[in-house]
Interface confidence: low
Amino acid sequence: LPAQVAFTPYAPEPGSTCRLREYYDQTAQMCCSKCSPGQHAKVFCTKTSDTVCDSCEDSTYTQLWNWVPECLSCGSRCSSDQVETQACTREQNRICTCRPGWYCALSKQEGCRLCAPLRKCRPGFGVARPGTETSDVVCKPCAPGTFSNTTSSTDICRPHQICNVVAIPGNASMDAVCTSTSPTRSMAPGAVHLPQPVSTRSQHTQPTPEPSTAPSTSFLLPMGPSPPAEGSTGD
């Protein structure tokens, strides 16, 4: 005969673990159902009744199978200098990132508190270090033989073109001008653009409980804790 399928709640066999999407309730000493993403535990299981789940309220979420008593609060709405790259739904937190051309100048525990525009290097200066999600552009003066004639957060110093006959010598902010005879070689006819950083910062570094007596967010781990093995002492 095939083995009987146990329905939650059930007492696990000594030394065995609860099945996927179940957790071990130390009070009931039973394997009980977890709630699906977008839900939370409204009533915890007992020896005779399974977990009762309920949908997350507006502006709250659970991303994983869980048994938290309250859904997690979605992060604050994105500020005007940020873009919402992921909306708050019942199953996922809002993600706010600094908009393109900006970086996070002041981080707050729940995400970026203040975005600032990336520095633009003025003519005569080029990008020495590109901006990232959390750091500004670093500019440097163009070295002899190179120039930048733009005000840009991405352009680097480019070599002067090499002329057969120079009409106007180049400087840090201007390319060399050749006489009507064409230059022997143009090192970099177009502006060189550094790749823009792509921000992936989330509002919350970890799921954060709504003000409540919610247990540790470690309860949101994909696999629930197992009951103590035979012969061991439980918590």
Epitope: S73, S76, S79, R113, Q206, T208, P211
Partner: antibody, heavy 117, light 111 residues
């Protein structure tokens, strides 16, 4: 149950130092920042600043830069406020408070620091 | 820094009265349509208690006679029917940016 438990009252002489502790329980301590608020006798609430419990980076309001230091021991889920070169005007109740995105949602019971010669 | 001003500094009202406290910030505390303005209640000799977040959202467990409204720079806390247990000092606080700043408080007493 979320709880913030602070150390007991302190009586100090001017020029001395004091260190107030705040132990968090009932939640993952490093999930949320910890703020500090001062209330002088008969006065209102003053926000002193906060400390990032993941990085240990403090932020101080202008009036609390210099003699005030926020620190952490995450292994025991505890935040600390140290005040050096105490003055009579530092006499106050100091509260630690959990810095949730919605607001200062849980508060310690407060620690009275009295500075008197 | 954003300055926060409350009025009145104190008031006395009868049980059952409607009580209104105002809070004005020196610049807007709104971001993308959300007002980062919180209200706290501190009863005599007690720890402050978090009442309202984002201008109008009651914290769970707070009696429904409390309500908050406003946006931008002008905010109001209303107690629709004052009860003896509402005797306290009420503080507004802006959470738009660091440093957070509190109003000076409004002391509510029973006549």
């Amino acid at each position: 149950e979320v709880q913030l438990v602070q150390s007991g009252p302190e009586l100090k002489k001017p020029g001395a130092s004091v260190k107030v502790s705040c132990k968090g329980s009932g939640y993952t301590f490093t999930d949320l920042g910890m703020g500090w608020v001062r209330q002088a006798p008969g006065q209102g609430l003053e926000w002193m600043g906060w400390i990032n419990t993941q990085t240990g980076e403090p932020f101080y309001a202008d009036d609390f830069k210099g003699r005030f230091v926020f620190s952490l021991d995450t292994s025991v889920s505890t935040a600390y406020l140290q005040i050096s070169s105490l003055k009579a005007e530092d006499t106050a109740v100091y509260y630690c408070t959990r810095d949730h995105p919605l607001g200062l949602d849980y508060w310690g019971q407060g620690t009275l620091v009295t500075v008197s010669s | 820094d954003i300055q926060v001003t409350q009025s009145p500094s104190s008031l006395s009202a009868s049980v059952g009265d409607r009580v209104t406290i105002t809070c004005i910030t020196s610049q807007s505390v709104d971001v993308a349509g959300v007002s980062y303005l919180n209200w706290y209640q501190q009863k005599p000799g007690k720890v402050p208690k978090f009442l309202i977040h984002k201008a109008s959202n009651l914290r769970s467990g707070v009696p429904s006679r409390f309500s908050g409204s406003g946006s931008g720079t002008d905010f109001t806390l209303t107690i629709s029917s004052l009860q003896p247990e509402d005797v306290a000092t009420y503080y507004c606080q802006q959470a738009r940016e660091d440093p957070y700043t509190f109003g000076q408080g409004t002391k509510v007493e029973i006549k």
